[in-house]
Amino acid sequence: AITEAREEAKPYPLFPGPLPGSLQTDHTSLLSLPHTSGYQPALMFSPTQPGRPYTGNVAIPRVTSAGSKLLPPLAFKHTVGHIILSEHKDVKFNCSISVPNIYQDTTISWWKDGKELLGAHHAITQFYPDDEVTAIIASFSITSVQRSDNGSYICKMKINNEEIVSDPIYIEVQGLPHFTKQPESMNVTRNTAFNLTCQAVGPPEPVNIFWVQNSSRVNEQPEKSPSVLTVPGLTEMAVFSCEAHNDKGLTVSKGVQINIKAIPSPPTEVSIHNSTAHSILISWVPGFDGYSPFRNCSVQVKEVDPLSNGSVMIFNTSASPHMYQIKQLQALANYSIGVSCMNEIGWSAVSPWILASTTEGAPSVAPLNVTVFLNESRDNVDIRWMKPLTKRQAGELVGYRISHVWQSAGISKELLEEVGQNNSRAQISVQVHNATCTVRIAAVTKGGVGPFSDPVKIFIPAHGWVDHAPSSTPAPGNADPVLII
């Protein structure tokens, strides 16, 4: 039988034999022989039949050196089997054994759950010699016990290479419930069921769980741990916690917020980072995600022009990074831009709209009717053209770029000239005689260089030739005009 020591307020007197019934104490200490100092509470024995030999782990009877008589078997005396006490209390327990004086160098070690207790543990061994035997008491004390002190403690003694093992002393440290699993914060869809889990352990068991929602208990009667709370659905945010009860009191879990997923808030702070003739780079600050991750965003672009049809261009993009380059825009145009983002619930409202403008574009057409001829001095080539019909969005004409390429006997050389916007003719110096000169002209605005005209070729003869006939860009067409003199 296991004697159970339990917490009890009154002290027990010294008692030479088995104590009746069970005992609960918070200051348990076991003793069978006089102690060196101080008050010593009672020794608690397992109730065994008097005179009955102990048949546990014993040392085999031995013959003395004289061979005259058998020694009795060596065994630890019975002691309390089970000590129950509250956390943070002190406990002291011991094991005792009487060893014939013929044995030398006896040592007692303490073991917990199969592992030897070494080092800082508070263990004391006391020896009480007599004529024939020495009584040995090994005491083990723990101050301010914790749950980690729970376990089975035994004494071991080595004599002549044999091991004697005591009965186990089970220490059970009781306290408030300890959570092994607490509810977790969640984001849930409105009116959709979800589960929360709570688990706590003693000792003492059982541990019972009450659920609390927004400071109100959900269940009138507790559930044994572990408990799963099924919430049928919420329409607004709620805070849940669980309370774990045992016979020592109750412990409250952390409160967890259960959020209701909603559409996101609109993005804020839409900013323009860079504008070109046909694109605008924007960024935005995402709004609150509505407790559900953003999936993607939509950039909405409206042209601000009384003559435009007011249609909205929509560009879909990923939610991250919070940046998008809007392309395929017209040059020198005003746009109103807004951003909206979505999560699994739906789209946010559109951000505050911002105004942005594209810059001037480059001309979209080349100068017309390009004509090239060699002047009388034969030192210059005259070039003439007509101003291109550029759109307003291309911006103001600032000039022309003339490309002339000289090819002679396997050598090719390109030169570029810039002329002002008021010109419609130019003169370039002959670079090489007995060579072909290919001329192309492009209009230039602040927005950039437009397309070059189709090439016009003229042959520059060696000195002494007399032809001044012009070469010109033919009327619309892609032929490669060349003038051979």
Epitope: N208, K224, G249, V252
Partner: antibody
């Protein structure tokens, strides 16, 4: 729904022993600790004893020598005995859930008189 | 012997807010005293309002809330109604026993 119902004698004589029974329904006594509380006429509530889920007990220290609380989990009953009754023990006796004093019986009124 | 003290009486106007308190003779009230608040109308059994970790009993409206204010347990009733007129008892747990206060008689004026 958890309900508690007290039963016992309406009248006891001085020096006699009072035995009260609390019958619990809707829950097992292995998961509910039960306390006994009394209220003399026109006075405040007074806690008497608790029996824990594991069977352990605690008592009002001023009345401990006269009180015994026990339970029969299979019958879902908690029994309180109070010895050496005196007229000052005249009161309504309630049983209630322990950590939350929020499930109460309707009470049983006991008069101590010769 | 620990004594738990409550205000003997208190009055509140309909719709008003009132805070009843509960003091321990042994020092500050803490969460480990598991302050319970019980409402009792004359001739009726008590009804638990707040218990454990200041959580409301099932069915108790959120006009009732429990807390620890300074070194005392407190019961706050917001939006007081005529049927809140009752006796209110607090109970504190001291390691192995409950101690009830003497009760507060709450009157709702008008």
């Amino acid at each position: 729904q958890v309900t508690l119902k007290e039963s016992g004698p309406v009248l006891v004589k001085p020096t006699e022993t009072l035995t009260l029974t609390c019958t619990v329904s809707g829950i097992s006594l292995s998961s509910f600790a039960i306390s006994w509380i009394r209220q003399p006429p026109g006075k405040a509530l007074e806690w008497l004893a608790v029996i824990w889920t594991g069977g352990g007990t605690d008592y009002n220290s001023a009345l401990k020598s006269r009180l015994t609380i026990s339970k029969d989990t299979s019958k879902s009953q908690v029994v309180l005995t109070m010895t050496n009754m005196d007229p000052v023990d005249t009161a309504t006796y309630y049983c209630a859930s322990h950590w939350y004093l929020d499930v109460w019986g309707q009470g049983t009124t006991v008069t101590v008189s010769s | 012997q620990t004594v738990v003290t409550q205000e003997p009486s208190f009055s509140v106007s309909p719709g008003g807010t009132v805070t009843l308190t509960c003091r321990s003779s042994t020092g500050a009230v803490s969460t480990s005293n598991y302050a319970n608040w019980v409402q009792q109308t004359p001739g009726q059994a008590p009804r638990g309002l707040i218990g454990g970790a200041n959580s409301r009993a099932p069915g108790i409206p959120d006009r009732f809330s429990g807390s620890i204010l300074g070194n005392k347990a407190a019961l706050t009733i917001t939006g007081a109604q005529a049927d809140d007129e009752s006796d209110y008892y607090c109970a504190l747990w001291f390691s192995n026993h409950w101690v009830f206060g003497g009760g507060t008689k709450l009157t709702v004026l008008g």
